[in-house]
Structures are given as structure tokens and as C-alpha cells.
């Protein structure tokens, strides 16, 4: 039932894709949880933020993340459908001036303080493998997704489209 892997097909296109607008096309404030309903939380420790994946106690407030959506144009020679080849890229900010970053060398997801324009490491291609679940693919490293490993967020290599449905790279967004 699975098609040719978008992961493999657009490796070069993803590196070449450009954000078509400096301003986000839309923004959402949402809590982020795993496919198994664990919450993604952010804690300030020793002047830096740590990211945790944990079960919240009943009535414990979920941390919110500002997701900023940007349109990205696929190069037309790659996309097969010319000027319409658009992707959505997102940045994720749990607190002012801090954004999730992909550290491809360490295979880790980190919170960095930075100014705009944001570096490519802060952009993730949005995938909806299910209508109520999203995945985040690194702009800087196609085929690598934000995932859950040992109760932390990590970068996980996905080598085929079948594996795009694996639970550890699926996240739920809740605006409530």
C-alpha cells in the first residue's frame, strides 16, 4: 500500500528547497505529545533548556509550543508538478527566542537561543502520515526525523516509507 519513499526521492530537493516567505504563513500554539500520549515538556536547568518526554500527572498543565508554518518551494525539476510543488516547513518554539534545533552530528534535538533569520537546523518538513498525527523531518538532513528515544527527543533515520508510520516519530498536536 505504500508508495515510493518521499524520504529518498526528495533528498536533493529538500536541500535545495527555499522558504518562499520570511514570515510564517500561519502559527499555532499547541501542546506536543507522542503517539502514546506522553507529553513533551521543557525545563530550564542551569541556564539552558532540557527537553523531556514524560507522563504528566492528572490535571498537570501541558507545555505549549509555538509552531510557525512556512511554505517551501520544491525545485520544479524534482517535484514533477512544476510551480505547485510546495511543502510546509515548521519551526517549534516553546519559549521566547528559543527554538528546537536538529543537531545532526550528535543525532540530538536541542533548544537553542537564536535570532531571526533562523538557521536551517531549526526548520522541519511537516508530514501527516495520519490526519491526527504529524512527523518532523530535518530540513538539513532529509530522511531524518524528530523521534523519541529513551524518554528524550532524538534524531532518527528513516530509510523507507513504511517506517514513516513507526510510532516513535509520530506526534500529536493539541490546541486545547
Amino acid at each position: 500500500a505504500f508508495g515510493i519513499s518521499g524520504v529518498q526521492k526528495y533528498t536533493r530537493a529538500l536541500h535545495d528547497s527555499s522558504i518562499t516567505g520570511i514570515s510564517p504563513i500561519t502559527e499555532y500554539l499547541a501542546s506536543l505529545s507522542t503517539y502514546n500520549d506522553q507529553s513533551i515538556t521543557f525545563a530550564l536547568e542551569d541556564e539552558s533548556y532540557e527537553i523531556y518526554v514524560e507522563d504528566l500527572k492528572k490535571d498537570e498543565k501541558k507545555d505549549k509550543v509555538l509552531l510557525s508554518y512556512y511554505e517551501s518551494q520544491h525545485p520544479s525539476n524534482e517535484s514533477g508538478d512544476g510551480v505547485d510543488g510546495k511543502m510546509l516547513m515548521v519551526t517549534l518554539s516553546p519559549t521566547k527566542d528559543f527554538w528546537l534545533h536538529a543537531n545532526n552530528k550528535e543525532h540530538s534535538v536541542e533548544l537553542h537561543k537564536c535570532e531571526k533569520p533562523l538557521p536551517d537546523q531549526a526548520f522541519f518538513v511537516l508530514h501527516n502520515m495520519h490526519s491526527n498525527c504529524v512527523s518532523f523531518e530535518c530540513k538539513t538532513d532529509p530522511g531524518v526525523f524528530i523521534g523519541v528515544k529513551d524518554n528524550h527527543l532524538a534524531l532518527i533515520k528513516v530509510d523507507s516509507s513504511e517506517n514513516l508510520c513507526t510510532e516513535n516519530i509520530l506526534f500529536k498536536l493539541s490546541e486545547t
Epitope: A1, F2, G3, I4, G6, K9, Y10, I25, T26, Y28, H74, S79, G80, D81, D84, G85, K86, M87, L88, V125, L126, H127, N128, M129, H130, S131, S161, L164, C165
Partner: antibody, heavy 122, light 107 residues
Framework: EVQLVESGGGLVQPGGSLRLSCAAS????????VSWVRQAPGKGLEWVAE????????NFNENFKGRFTISVDNAKNSLYLQMNSLRAEDTAVYYC???????????????WGQGTLVTVSS | DIQMTQSPSSLSASVGDRVTITCKAS??????LAWYQQKPGKAPKLLIY???NRYTGVPSRFSGSGSGTDFTLTISSLQPEDFATYYC?????????FGGGTKVEIK
């Protein structure tokens, strides 16, 4: 050029079934969420369901769950809508539609087929 | 489900007129709104998405504005080819719901 071509409409009796098809071309079918949207004669638009060919995941308007099923055949680049227990109020033009974005459903309809008319009458 | 209410349901205008159509959501939808144009016997065409972004190839005389619950589609100078029915649609969240439509007729 992106093309969506619906077929399979026609006259059917109340309680009957019909299977609509939508042939897609000009884009990588598996990379986009695709939807069915219907329009009763002289009325407004109503979203029916969507599906992501790459995963088979679907999403339905609650009003149609149970009677309608959405499916794809990736080898044929085709989208289907199986409609059962049809009623007079299901009489409408049925459109297939596609969004503007790879991989992501924002339920925006950037491309539409020409539509196929389904008439439910005895 | 969130309801989308368009007004007016129809209007008469002349070529060159500035035309404004409104759409009201029953709850806050942020900027998650699209506008479509439909001519008789044809499929709808996407004009505006995320409230104010013109889709590829849409003339600059079409503009969208608003956020939250109140949205506007403006045609700055009506052209002969603009006589049609216009629909707003709540996007992003399921189910996507459409307004009842506004028919723009020749005066």
C-alpha cells in the same frame, strides 16, 4: 499538468450502491492527501472524506461514516469512493480534490476534478 | 462543528465596482480560512488561503483579510469574469466546513 478525472456517477435507486473513481495524473499521487467533496444541485459544498495514499490513513466527515468508504489504488493512481445505502439527499456532483502541499493535509483544495453527478431516485 | 456564515447571500454589482463579501465563523478559527470562486457547471477554484494569501495565478484584485471569527474577501475592481459564486471554507482542522456561498450577479 495536474489532472483529476472523476467517473462512475449515474442514476441509482434509494438503498443502492455506487463506486466513484478519480484518476490522478501530472503529480506524484502518493505524496498528497486527496479528498472527495460533494455539491447538491443548487446548494453549497460539503466535504466527505480524505485519504493519504502513502499510508492509507483516512479521515471522514462524521455524517458519512459507516455508509461511505474511501480508498486508493496506488498502482493505478486512482482514488475511490464506495457509497452504500444511498438516499435521495445524496444526489449531488461529487468532486475529487487535492491540496497544495506535499505530505501534509491542511484540508485546502487547490486542484479539483470536473465532478461526476450521482442521482438517487426511484 | 464550526459553522461558517456568509453575507450577503447574493449581490448585484457593475464592472469596476469594489465588492466585499464577509464570512463569520461560529468560533475562533485563527487565520484558517480559504476562499473559492465557482462558476456554473464548473468546479470551484482556490483564490485565497490562510485568510490573506493569494493562490498561484490569482489576480491581485482579489484580497482576503481577517482573523478569529470575521473574514472578508474583497474584489477591488470587478471584472466580467468575476461574476460567480464565492465560498469561504474553514481549513486546517477536520471537518472543513464551507459557508453557504455568495452569488455575485451583474447589475
Amino acid at each position: 499538468e495536474v489532472q483529476l478525472v472523476e467517473s462512475g456517477g449515474g442514476l441509482v435507486q434509494p438503498g443502492g450502491s455506487l463506486r466513484l473513481s478519480c484518476a490522478a495524473s501530472g503529480f506524484t499521487f502518493t505524496d498528497y492527501w486527496v479528498s472527495w467533496v460533494r455539491q447538491a444541485p443548487g446548494k453549497g459544498l460539503e466535504w466527505v472524506a480524505e485519504i493519504y495514499p502513502n499510508s492509507g490513513a483516512d479521515n471522514f466527515n462524521e455524517n458519512f461514516k459507516g455508509r461511505f468508504t474511501i480508498s486508493v489504488d496506488n498502482a493505478k493512481n486512482s482514488l475511490y469512493l464506495q457509497m452504500n445505502s444511498l438516499r435521495a439527499e445524496d444526489t449531488a456532483v461529487y468532486y475529487c480534490a487535492r491540496g497544495p502541499y506535499y505530505y501534509s493535509t491542511q484540508i485546502i483544495f487547490a486542484y479539483w476534478g470536473q465532478g461526476t453527478l450521482v442521482t438517487v431516485s426511484s | 462543528d464550526i459553522q461558517m456564515t456568509q453575507s450577503p447571500s447574493s449581490l448585484s454589482a457593475s464592472v469596476g465596482d469594489r465588492v466585499t463579501i464577509t464570512c463569520k465563523a461560529s468560533q475562533n478559527v485563527g487565520n484558517n480560512l480559504a476562499w473559492y470562486q465557482q462558476k456554473p457547471g464548473k468546479a470551484p477554484k482556490l483564490l485565497i488561503y490562510y485568510a490573506s494569501n493569494r493562490y498561484t495565478g490569482v489576480p491581485s484584485r482579489f484580497s482576503g483579510s481577517g482573523s478569529g471569527t470575521d473574514f472578508t474577501l474583497t474584489i477591488s475592481s470587478l471584472q466580467p469574469e468575476d461574476f460567480a459564486t464565492y465560498y469561504c471554507q474553514r481549513i486546517y482542522n477536520s471537518p472543513p466546513t464551507f459557508g453557504g456561498g455568495t452569488k455575485v450577479e451583474i447589475k
